[in-house]
C-alpha cells in the first residue's frame, strides 16, 4: 500500500480502539460541480432496459434514504417498443458505504457498513445453456 | 422526519463541533451475504451498451480504490453484433459517500464527501434532434 506521512496537525485520538474508531465531519463536501443532473434523470424511462426507482428508508442509516432500481421487464425494449425476450434486463449493482448508528438510536456514533444497491438496469445477451 | 429516542448507552461527545463531528467504527459490517458476485461480473461485456472499468485510486480517500465505468461505444450493439447509431450508450451515474482524510494525511480524521461515479452503461433513445 501507499504510506502517507502523518500530518503533525492531526487530532489526537485517545480512543482505545484507535485506529478502528475515527472522527468524521458530517458537513458533506460535494465534488459533483460540473454535472448536469437533468442528463441522466430520465434514463430510467428511455433505456431499452427501463427501471423503476423504489425508496428505501432507514432512520438508523446515513444516508437514511436510498433509491433502489428494479428492472421493469424481464426482456428489453426493441425498436418497435415491444419487449424482446431474446434479451434480458438486468440490474447493475454497486457496493456502497453507509453509516449505521451503533449503538442503535445514537446520534453521534456510527459503524461503517457495506451494502449492495441496484443503480439502474442494462440489457444483456443471455448465456444460453442447453440442458442435456 | 422520524424522531428516534436517544439510547442512554450512547458515547458522550465533548467535541465542540458536535453533532457535526461523530465517531465512526471502521470495522466494516458487510450486509451483502446472499449475493453471487459472479452473476453481475460480466454484464460489462454482455451488455448492448458494454463498458470498461477504470481503477481510480486516491490514498486520501476511503475507500481508496473506486472502479469507474466508461462506455465502450457511442452507439449500442445490435442483434448482429454491430454498433447501431440510432441508439446511444450512456453511463448510469450514482452519488456515493466516501471519507476524505481531513486534515490531509491524517489516519484518524475524515470528512464525508459526496462523489458521482459511473457504475455501468445502459442503452437509450435520445429525446430529439438539434435544439435551437
Amino acid at each position: 500500500g501507499i504510506t502517507i506521512p502523518r500530518n503533525p496537525g492531526c487530532p489526537n485520538s485517545e480512543d482505545k480502539n484507535f485506529p478502528r474508531t475515527v472522527m468524521v465531519n458530517l458537513n458533506i463536501h460535494n465534488r459533483n460541480t460540473n454535472t448536469n443532473p437533468k442528463r441522466s434523470s430520465d434514463y430510467y424511462n428511455r433505456s431499452t432496459s427501463p427501471w423503476n426507482l423504489h425508496r428505501n428508508e432507514d432512520p438508523e442509516r446515513y444516508p437514511s434514504v436510498i433509491w433502489e432500481a428494479k428492472c421493469r421487464h424481464l426482456g428489453c425494449i426493441n425498436a418497435d417498443g415491444n419487449v424482446d425476450y431474446h434479451m434480458n434486463s438486468v440490474p447493475i449493482q454497486q457496493e456502497i458505504l453507509v453509516l449505521r448508528r451503533e449503538p442503535p438510536h445514537c446520534p453521534n456514533s456510527f459503524r461503517l457498513e457495506k451494502i449492495l444497491v441496484s443503480v439502474g438496469c442494462t440489457c444483456v445477451t443471455p448465456i444460453v445453456h442447453h440442458v442435456a | 422526519g422520524i424522531t428516534i429516542p436517544r439510547n442512554p448507552g450512547c458515547p458522550n461527545s465533548e467535541d465542540k463541533n458536535f453533532p457535526r463531528t461523530v465517531m465512526v467504527n471502521l470495522n466494516i459490517h458487510n450486509r451483502n451475504t446472499n449475493t453471487n458476485p459472479k452473476r453481475s461480473s460480466d454484464y460489462y461485456n454482455r451488455s448492448t451498451s458494454p463498458w470498461n472499468l477504470h481503477r481510480n485510486e486516491d490514498p486520501e480517500r476511503y475507500p481508496s480504490v473506486i472502479w469507474e465505468a466508461k462506455c465502450r461505444h457511442l452507439g449500442c450493439i445490435n442483434a448482429d453484433g454491430n454498433v447501431d447509431y440510432h441508439m446511444n450508450s450512456v453511463p448510469i451515474q450514482q452519488e456515493i459517500l466516501v471519507l476524505r482524510r481531513e486534515p490531509p494525511h491524517c489516519p484518524n480524521s475524515f470528512r464525508l464527501e459526496k462523489i458521482l461515479v459511473s457504475v455501468g452503461c445502459t442503452c437509450v433513445t435520445p429525446i430529439v434532434h438539434h435544439v435551437a
Epitope: 442528463r39 | 470498461n52 465502450r72 461505444h73 447509431y85 435520445p126 429525446i127 430529439v128 434532434h129
Partner: antibody, heavy 123, light 107 residues
Framework: QVQLVQSGAEVKKPGASVKVSCKAS????????MHWVKQAPGQRLEWMGG????????SYNQNFKGKATLTVDTSASTAYMELSSLRSEDTAVYYC????????????????WGQGTTVTVSS | EIVLTQSPGTLSLSPGERATLSCRAS???????LAWYQQKPGQAPRLLIY???SRATGIPDRFSGSGSGTDFTLTISRLEPEDFAVYYC????????FGQGTKLEIK
C-alpha cells in the same frame, strides 16, 4: 458561440504518423461527442469515427479501424485524431465536427464543423 | 452499408430560380437520421436540415427538406447568390454515409 479550431496543415512522408488537434470553445466540451470526417480530393465525405469525451466511448467506421485513433484531453477541451502508417491515399482534408449530447440529441447528429486540416502524404 | 446517390451531379440555375436536389438511398433510411449540408469552396460543411425536414439554427426558410424511406429532397425556393455551393445528404443507422454531392452552379 461554438467554435472548433483545428491545427495547421501537415506534410508527411509515407509510413509516418500525424496527429491533428481540434480545440473546442463556446460550449461544455464534456457534454457533446466529437467526430472526424475525411474529404479526399474528388471523393465524397467519409465519416471516420466519433468519441464521447465524458465516457471515453469511441465508435469507428470499419474502414478506419487500425488507421485512425481518436482521443481527447478534457482539461484542454481538445480532441485529437492520429493517423498511422500514412500512405498517399490518406492525403485529404480532415474535419472535426461536434456531435450530439446523447440526451437532447443523438451522439451522431453533427452540427458544427472545424475549418479542416490538410494532410499531404508525399515522398 | 447504405449508399446515398445524389442527382443531378451538377445543377445550373440562375438566382431567383427554384432548386430541387434529390438523394436516393440504397435501402430505407429513417427520416429522423437524414441530414443535408452545404459546402462552399475552401470551407467546412454547414448543417442545413436534420431529421429530413427540420431546419438547423440560423438557416433561412427558403431551404426545406422532405421525403421518407429511400427518397429525400432538398428544395431551395428562391436562389440567392450565396446559395451556389455543393450540397451533401447524409444518413446514419447501421452505417454512417454521405452522398457524393450535387454542385449547384450559376447558369
Amino acid at each position: 458561440q461554438v467554435q472548433l479550431v483545428q491545427s495547421g496543415a501537415e506534410v508527411k512522408k509515407p509510413g509516418a504518423s500525424v496527429k491533428v488537434s481540434c480545440k473546442a470553445s463556446g460550449y461544455t466540451f464534456n457534454e457533446y461527442t466529437m467526430h472526424w470526417v475525411k474529404q479526399a480530393p474528388g471523393q465524397r465525405l467519409e465519416w471516420m469515427g466519433g468519441i464521447n469525451p465524458n465516457s471515453g466511448g469511441v465508435s469507428y467506421n470499419q474502414n478506419f479501424k487500425g488507421k485512425a485513433t481518436l482521443t481527447v484531453d478534457t482539461s484542454a477541451s481538445t480532441a485529437y485524431m492520429e493517423l498511422s502508417s500514412l500512405r498517399s491515399e490518406d492525403t485529404a482534408v480532415y474535419y472535426c465536427a461536434r456531435g450530439g449530447d446523447g440526451y437532447y440529441t443523438n451522439y451522431f447528429d453533427i452540427d458544427y464543423w472545424g475549418q479542416g486540416t490538410t494532410v499531404t502524404v508525399s515522398s | 452499408e447504405i449508399v446515398l446517390t445524389q442527382s443531378p451531379g451538377t445543377l445550373s440555375l440562375s438566382p431567383g430560380e427554384r432548386a430541387t436536389l434529390s438523394c436516393r438511398a440504397s435501402q430505407s433510411v429513417s427520416s429522423s437520421y437524414l441530414a443535408w449540408y452545404q459546402q462552399k469552396p475552401g470551407q467546412a460543411p454547414r448543417l442545413l436540415i436534420y431529421g429530413a425536414s427540420s431546419r438547423a439554427t440560423g438557416i433561412p426558410d427558403r431551404f426545406s427538406g422532405s421525403g421518407s424511406g429511400t427518397d429525400f429532397t432538398l428544395t431551395i425556393s428562391r436562389l440567392e447568390p450565396e446559395d451556389f455551393a455543393v450540397y451533401y445528404c447524409q444518413q446514419y443507422g447501421s452505417s454512417y454515409t454521405f452522398g457524393q454531392g450535387t454542385k449547384l452552379e450559376i447558369k
